[in-house]
Every structure is written in C-alpha cells, then in structure tokens.
C-alpha cells in the first residue's frame, strides 16, 4: 500500500494551529487548498464575531485536516467540539440569515477520539 | 443597509487599461470577500476574480489571469479591478458583489453595475 | 473548469403554473449550488444557496433541490414579479462558474 504523503498547510488562517500538514481531499471534498481556503474565506463575519473560540480550529480541522504519515485517513474534529461550535455560533448565523451548513452535520463526525475513530477534540 | 457602487467604466481602445472601483457601505468590509461577476451585452453571467476579507488571498478566471488585478483598500471600504491589455471580448457589464455563505460562496449584494466597452 | 448547463434556455408560462429549471453540473458539486434571479437592466438577486436553503427574504414559492450534478430550482406558482431570467452558479471549486440562465417569459 502506498505511503500517505502530507502536504504543508498553505491556508493562512489554518496555519499556528498545532498542526501543519494536511491531505487532500478535505472532509468537504475539495482536492484542491486553494478551492477550500475560497470557502473558509466566507466564514471570516463568524470567526471575528467571537461566537466560540473553538471556531477557527474547527474549521480548519474540516477543510484542512490533520494529516500523519502512521495513518491512511485524514483526522478531523471530533462530533463533541462540531456540537460545542454549533451551540455557540448557530445562533449568530442565523442572525447573518444563513443556515447551519449541512456540510458541517455535527452527525458525520466521530463522537470522540479513540483508537478506532481518531478526532481532534479541540 | 448594504450598498455597493461601481465606478470606473467607459470606453477604450483594445490593449489600453481602466481601473474599476466599487465603494462599499452598510457592512463591515473588512469581514467579507469581495468579487467581480460580469456580463457580456445579452449574455450570461460569468465571475471574474475574487479577494479575501484579508486581501491576502486572490482568485482569478483563467481569461484575465495575467491581466486584471483585483485588490481592495480597506481604509476606503473600496474594491478595484486593475484591467491591463483589454480585448474587446472584456466589453461587459461588471457588477462587484460582497461574497459569503458560510461555507458556500454566493453572492448576497450586488452592485448596479459599471459598463465598459473595448472598441477602436 | 466544472460547467453549468441549464435547460430549458427558455420557457413560457402562465401566472400560476409550477416552473421547474434544471442545472447539470459536468462533475459532481455535492451541494454547492447556489440560484438568481435577474431581472433586465438590473443586477442578479440571490434567491437560494447550497442547493435548496432559501435566502433571507426570498418568497417561499421559490425551493431548490438536488445534489452531486443534478440540480432543481421550483416555482411552485409564477407571480407576475417572477418573469426574469434565472442562473444556477456553483461554488465548489474555482473558476466559479454559472450556467448560460434560463429566461421565463409570459405566455
């Protein structure tokens, strides 16, 4: 089986987060860091409302996920720190008339971080 | 409320240049990606070029890429498109337009539109 | 570069007839499908985003649907205010791109 190569994060709002290299595709399917950082961009009214500080760290953890060459899937956020994030800044997106994205379905990611489901927690 | 007006249109010769402008209010620009859609005279809508809330990031249409600039001066609430070695098939409507969705881009505001025609 | 193409190019049709537009992404989009309306002379008005979520303020009579290539924008009864052109524009993956529009006229 061939080796996962990582790639480094070149998405500047993902970069100083703890980690720094990612695969594509992303959990949203984008094969290209160009094509996910377009869709990041329009998170930026939410990021600098406050709403939660787990915010950017989540997102990035979607579009960019941790990425390990002793792993073959990407490891994205955990459905305990979607659901925190949800909680806190739903209410702000609703207050911009947008809807929670059905992208980020707080259901398509593991409940928490174990040896057969690996997640950052946040 | 959200306004957006462009500026900046006219007439010029193919291979000359024009600076378009769109004065933004109503919203907090530095928060949102902007971009320039256009349209060519009884044509379909085609997106030219695209710029962070930061300014740090740029996307383009592969036809002007190497020949418009877009930037944004955030002191000004304004958004230009530079546009170099115009041919006649950049003769169109250009709207500027504040972009977000949240995941999704859209175009939620537009501006009325600023026309621009390369002709000898 | 994923191309948007959309049928029919135009339509006739009745106040109070069911409308149905059609968009056909050349590759999958999943849900990043976005509609607009636009009327002559004036700027397109976004009226649904990621495929089937009504913007703000749009009249409910609007609804889209779809996901991967196939996308769907109804008007579930034509109002007088509705004969426009539409364009369906996806957001997956630059360039973005939008279908050539569909123009509703009066029958």
């Known amino acids: 089986e061939e080796e996962r190569r990582c790639d480094p994060i070149r998405i500047s709002m993902c970069q100083n987060l703890g980690y720094n290299v990612t695969k594509m595709p992303n959990l949203v399917g984008h094969e290209l860091q160009t094509d996910a950082e377009l869709q990041l961009t329009t998170f930026t009214p939410l990021i600098q409302y406050g709403c939660s500080s787990q915010l950017q760290f989540f997102l990035c953890s979607v579009y960019v996920p941790m990425c390990t060459e002793k792993i073959n899937i990407p490891i994205g956020p955990c459905g305990g720190m979607c659901l925190s994030v949800k909680r806190r800044c739903e209410p702000v997106l609703k207050e911009f008339g947008f809807a929670w994205p059905e992208s980020l379905n707080c259901s398509k990611f593991p409940p928490q971080n174990d040896h057969n489901h690996m997640c950052m927690e946040g | 409320e959200v306004q957006l007006v462009e500026s900046g249109g006219g007439l010029v010769k193919p291979g000359g240049s024009l600076r378009l402008s769109c004065a933004a209010s109503g919203f907090t620009f530095t928060s949102y990606a902007m971009s320039w859609v256009r349209q060519a005279p009884g044509k379909g809508l085609e997106w030219v070029s695209a710029i962070s809330g930061s300014g740090g990031s740029t996307y383009y249409a592969e036809s002007v890429k190497g020949r418009f600039t877009i930037s944004r001066d955030d002191s000004k609430n304004t958004l230009y498109l530079q546009m170099n070695s115009l041919k006649t098939e950049d003769t169109a409507v250009y709207y500027c337009?504040?972009?977000?969705?949240?995941?999704?881009?859209?175009?939620?505001?537009w501006g009325q539109g600023t026309l621009v025609t390369v002709s000898s | 570069d994923i191309q948007m193409t959309q049928s029919p190019s135009s339509l006739s049709a009745s106040v109070g007839d069911r409308v149905t537009i059609t968009c056909r992404a050349s590759?999958?989009?999943?849900?990043?499908l976005n509609w607009y309306q636009q009327k002559p002379g004036k700027a397109p008005k976004l009226l649904i985003y990621a495929a089937s979520s009504l913007q703000s303020g749009v009249p409910s009579r609007f609804s889209g649907s779809g996901s991967g290539t196939d996308f769907t924008l109804t008007i579930s009864s034509l109002q007088p205010e509705d004969f426009a052109t539409y364009y369906c524009q996806q957001s997956y993956s630059t360039p973005l791109t939008f279908g050539g529009g569909t123009k509703v006229e009066i029958k």
């Open positions: 590759q999958s989009i999943s849900s990043y």
């Open positions: 337009a504040r972009a977000t969705g949240f995941g999704t881009v859209v175009f939620d505001y």
